[in-house]
Amino acid sequence: DFGLDCDEHSTESRCCRYPLTVDFEAFGWDWIIAPKRYKANYCSGECEFVFLQKYPHTHLVHQANPRGSAGPCCTPTKMSPINMLYFNGKEQIIYGKIPAMVVDRCGCS
Amino acid sequence: DFGLDCDEHSTESRCCRYPLTVDFEAFGWDWIIAPKRYKANYCSGECEFVFLQKYPHTHLVHQANPRGSAGPCCTPTKMSPINMLYFNGKEQIIYGKIPAMVVDRCGCS
């Protein structure tokens, strides 16, 4: 189970993980106390048949080719959480682990 | 955490789970002993901004809008295994649980 890693200038056409730093202050998300920025990463690229397919199911759907089914798309296949300090809706300060905030690997599904 | 369910006649445009029966015999996959057919399901539909987004990460990437990033796509967000009886490459009969063979839920990621 592997995935490609690219940098932001790469002309790689296949499904790849790219670096992306999310800046909460720049978005005006002032309810987030910490971190103000974090490395989120994102997935982009083409999913040619069989390349980086995560599941046999993807291959089966391609073979069955039902009406309206699109090809597989480049999407996170492994994600990890980050710890965040933030205000909730009641203005209480919460410290917690927020799941699926960082893309660790991209694949076609 | 929910997903839409549609049938093959539905005019729903959004990301939805559709029924699909995979027929191994029709594919010529004669190394599979059982089941010969199973309900795999598949995902199809549009991922308008925020609709059925599985992760906050998806929203953040949309907001950051990095070069080359596509919008979220309709993909399995929950899958389950099936038990299969099949010949392996050494012509031995194997009974095992094959992961991620059935789509239980679709979402945008």
């Epitope: 790469s10 002309t11 790689e12 056409s13 | 070069r67 080359g68």
Partner: antibody, heavy 122, light 107 residues
């Protein structure tokens, strides 16, 4: 025969808009990335924009980012370039070009159209 | 962005002679480099991709070499139809960039 035919060029005032089209034939259009490359009169080639085969990924030169939009209609085998907020320096022949898919990188174009002339002048 | 420098700007060669064109990149582009030929009033024509592979239908007198930052296009014996402008292009990084061109003219 593989062919690309551009249209939609013309004379437009600064600040104006145009939509260029490129009709493709002779190959499986949706399988190939496409680019727009321009050439100002008497000058060299300048890459403008590219789009993946599916249309899911788009790329732009810094000089046109925010003003030009590339898109494609795979059902009609057609590539588009929407040109907004045009400037005198956008005056050029605009060529559409098919990606050769020689390896996994976008960029080397094996088929080019003859181009359509865009003139930005008051 | 990666800056492409072609030299010489103009090359005067007699038919039948050898022509050597140079392309230098400001940073490594691996082998992701192409050469194009353009004649007046015509669209560019792909000659070489991957730094050294001839495109379909390109005569064997055209050859490319190099990798990293230094590349060469060689025309072993110039024919009358080879007098044109030649451009190198890197496709390793966005934005894609072209060299300024080398005009090969009849001596």
């Amino acid at each position: 025969e593989v062919q690309l035919l551009e249209s939609g060029g013309g004379l437009v005032q600064p600040g104006g808009s145009l939509r260029l089209s490129c009709a493709a034939s002779g190959f499986t259009f949706s399988s190939y990335a496409m680019s727009w490359v321009r050439q100002a009169p008497g000058k060299g080639l300048e890459w403008v924009s590219a789009i993946s085969g599916s249309g899911g990924s788009t790329f732009y030169a810094d000089s046109v980012t925010g003003r030009f939009t590339i898109s494609r209609d795979n059902s009609k085998n057609t590539l588009f370039l929407q040109l907004n907020s045009l400037r005198a320096e956008d005056t050029a022949v605009y060529h559409c070009a098919k990606d050769g898919r020689f390896n996994w990188n976008y960029g080397a174009s094996d088929i080019w159209g003859q181009g359509t002339m865009v003139t930005v002048s008051s | 962005e990666i800056v492409m420098t072609q030299s010489p700007a103009t090359l005067s060669v007699s038919p039948g002679e050898r022509a050597t064109l140079s392309c230098r990149t400001s940073q490594s582009v691996s082998s992701n480099l192409a050469w194009y030929q353009q004649k007046p009033g015509q669209a560019p024509r792909l000659l070489i991709y991957g730094a050294s592979t001839r495109a379909t239908g390109i005569p064997a007198r055209f050859s490319g070499s190099g990798s990293g930052t230094e590349f060469t296009l060689t025309i072993s014996s110039l024919q009358s139809e080879d007098f044109a402008v030649y451009y190198c292009q890197q496709y390793n990084n966005w934005p894609l960039t072209f060299g300024g061109g080398t005009k090969v003219e009849i001596k």
